[in-house]
């Protein structure tokens, strides 16, 4: 049975040209995290695997940095980076947990951080 919950940074906004940290945290489960995949819509951004370390997908290498922790740092943001991001936790024995983050990249300096929220 899947008992865990994923807490994410929720709905966030950032300035064009700036950087942002995408964070997810899996709690309330003793399941072993095998791998965390970060995806934007259907595109793979990065992988963090317990045995093999970090991998940043080639098309994002210049603007994505691993960490902190299992999180992901997006740099040199553009308006095109606006959209949904998913952290997909592959765990044993529970299975797959998915967290969603919505990022809005703003032209002006009015970027504010949204509230944190949980996805069961």
């Amino acid at each position: 049975m899947m008992t865990g919950t994923i807490e994410t940074t929720g709905n966030i906004s950032a300035e064009k040209g700036g950087s942002i940290i995408l964070q997810c945290h899996l709690s309330s489960t003793t399941a072993q995290v095998t791998q965390v995949n970060w995806e934007q819509q259907d595109q793979l951004l990065a992988i963090c695997n317990a045995d093999l370390g970090w991998h940043i997908s080639p098309s994002f290498k210049d603007r994505v940095a691993p960490g902190p922790g299992l999180g992901l740092t997006l740099q040199s943001l553009t308006v095109n980076d606006t959209g949904e991001y998913f952290c997909i936790y592959h765990t044993y024995p529970d299975g797959t947990y998915t967290g969603r983050i919505f990022l809005e990249v703003l032209e002006s300096s009015v970027a504010e951080h949204g509230a944190r929220f949980q996805i069961p």
Epitope: T34, D51, G53, H55, H90, Y92
Partner: antibody, heavy 120, light 110 residues
Framework: EVQLLESGGGLVQPGGSLRLSCAAS????????MSWVRQAPGKGLEWVSL????????YYADSVKGRFTISRDNSKNTLYLQMNSLRAEDTAVYYC?????????????WGQGTTVTVSS | QSVLTQPLSASGTPGQRVTISCSGV????????VSWYQQLPGTAPKLLIY???QRPSGVPDRFSGSKSGTSASLAISGLQSEDEADYYC???????????FGGGTKLTVL
Amino acid sequence: EVQLLESGGGLVQPGGSLRLSCAASGFTFDDYVMSWVRQAPGKGLEWVSLINWNGDKTYYADSVKGRFTISRDNSKNTLYLQMNSLRAEDTAVYYCARHWIVFQYGLDVWGQGTTVTVSS
Amino acid sequence: QSVLTQPLSASGTPGQRVTISCSGVSSNIEIKYVSWYQQLPGTAPKLLIYNSHQRPSGVPDRFSGSKSGTSASLAISGLQSEDEADYYCTSWDDRLKSWVFGGGTKLTVL
């Protein structure tokens, strides 16, 4: 179409060397962990070696450790296996295989194999 | 000697259900995922089951995988003559840090 094509097999004397290549096509090679698996005549499958996305993490079966080296060139979409100090027991069909995006899940794409014969 | 243990052979008649077992230890099957492969004579292996119980697209639902403790099994229902092949289980071993295979099971359709 997702494809793996091995080459470089042949007849070699004991103590000799051989370099196998595996050309990948139809997928983003950089995003996948790769392995070499071999099969001696009339025998079962034996895993040989594994390499992560950018080649900074490699693993080997005890039977080939110190003699074989796995590597990859992502710019050429090619996987390699450098085999040194070859022995008669290395005679086998060598397959390159792609791991599932979560590498521990399984090997989802296999090449057709290349035959290595070690004999005097 | 393979790290994972499979029966050397199995057999069944067309339409029957056949199960092939795969036995491991606490550092592989018990805490990791199992995958199963079918190898027809003279061909490369083909993935049948990944993540212990999931089927890749194109694999008939006659094939199913399950796992309990340090053992896993592959079940083939509605056996067909074209299922005659060698079947292999495999898992990542956390202690050895290696990909381990079973010795293979030769399935004969009588």
